[in-house]
Amino acid sequence: MAVTACQGLGFVVSLIGIAGIIAATCMDQWSTQDLYNNPVTAVFNYQGLWRSCVRESSGFTECRGYFTLLGLPAMLQAVRALMIVGIVLGAIGLLVSIFALKCIRIGSMEDSAKANMTLTSGIMFIVSGLCAIAGVSVFANMLVTNFWMSTANMYTGMGGMVQTVQTRYTFGAALFVGWVAGGLTLIGGVMMCIACRGLAPEETNYKAVSYHASGHSVAYKPGGFKASTGFGSNTKNKKIYDGGARTEDEVQSYPSKHDYV
C-alpha cells in the first residue's frame, strides 16, 4: 500500500512539475525591466525564450520574435535546449510511469517489469528536473551579470553626441515557475525511485524440495522461486522432470511453509 501511494504521489508531483516546466518555457516573463527608478513608467519591457514584448499602461502589448536579432546569444540557445530536453524526458517519463503504476494492470505484467519501468521513469524525472533547474539558473546568472554591468555610457558618434543609458533587467515570473517546477519534477523522480525499491524485494531463492510420485520415478520440483528486479528466465515456477532427483543438496527434507504441495 505504501509503495502504491509513494509511486502514485511521485507520478502526480512529476506531472505537476512537467506541466510547470512547459509553462515556464512558453512564458514571456523570463526577464522583466527593472522599475527601481521609474515605478510608474508608461512603457514596460519583458522577455522570454522566444520573444520580447512591450506593454503599456494603456494595455497595448506588442511582441516580436528573436528572429529580428542579428545573432542569437549562445546562452539563449543553451537554455532553450535544456528546457526542451527537460520537457521531452519528462514526457517520456510520464508515459513510462503510467504503465509502471501498480494500480494499473496491463496484461500479465510482473512486478519486476513494473519496478524496472518505475526506476526508468524516476531517473527520467530526475534528469528532467535537473535540466529545467540548470536552464533557469543559467538564464538567472546572465541576468545578474547584466544587472551589475548595466551602467550609463556616453560616447561621441559620427554625427554628434550619442548617449546610451542602460536599463536594468530583473528576474521574471517564469524563472520562479521554472525553479519550482524543476524541483517538483526532481522530487517526483526521487519518489518513483524509492517506490521502485518497494516494488522489487530483495532477491530470494527458496530451497526446492522433491517429492516422489507414487508408482513413478518422476519428481515435482518447484524451480527455486526467485524474486528479482530483472527479467530473468527463473521468474516463473517450472516443473522439472529429472528422473526422481533428490533435493539440491542430495538430502531428503521435509516440507516447509515455503513448499508447494
Partner: nanobody
Framework: QVKLEESGGGLVEAGGSLRLSCVAS????????MGWYRQAPGKQRELVAT???????NYADSVKGRFTISRDNAKNTVYLQMNTLRPGDTAVYYC??????????????WGPGTQVTVSS
C-alpha cells in the same frame, strides 16, 4: 549596434511646414518610447513630442496643435509633422528612442540631429 538617423530638416519660411523622419536600424528587438527633442543655440535641449508603441502621444505646450508625432512600428520609424512654423522653432531636432537591442539589453539612444531653420 543601434543607430538613429534623422532626415527632413531644412530652411523654411514662417507659417510653412516640414516633416521630419527618424529611422532606427541595427539589432533591434523592440522600440519603446520614441520622441523628438530640440536644442536652440545657447539653450538647453527640450522635449518636443514623444510617442509610445501603442500610439500614446505627449507634446510640449509650445507645439500643441501645430506639431503631430506618429510612428510606424513595422518600419521602426517615427515622424514629426510640423505645421505653422515660427522663427522660435529654429533649432537642431534630435530623435530619441528607448531600444531593446538584445536579451535583457535596453538603452536610450540619440540621433545626430537635423537642422530646422525658420526664416521670418
Amino acid at each position: 549596434q543601434v543607430k538613429l538617423e534623422e532626415s527632413g530638416g531644412g530652411l523654411v519660411e514662417a507659417g510653412g511646414s516640414l516633416r521630419l523622419s527618424c529611422v532606427a536600424s541595427g539589432s533591434i528587438l523592440n522600440l519603446m518610447t520614441m520622441g523628438w527633442y530640440r536644442q536652440a543655440p545657447g539653450k538647453q535641449r527640450e522635449l518636443v513630442a514623444t510617442a509610445t508603441p501603442g500610439g500614446t502621444t505627449n507634446y510640449a505646450d509650445s507645439v500643441k496643435g501645430r506639431f503631430t508625432i506618429s510612428r510606424d512600428n513595422a518600419k521602426n520609424t517615427v515622424y514629426l509633422q510640423m505645421n505653422t512654423l515660427r522663427p522660435g522653432d529654429t533649432a537642431v531636432y534630435y530623435c530619441n528612442a528607448d531600444v531593446v537591442y538584445g536579451l535583457a539589453r535596453q538603452g536610450n539612444y540619440w540621433g545626430p540631429g537635423t537642422q530646422v531653420t525658420v526664416s521670418s
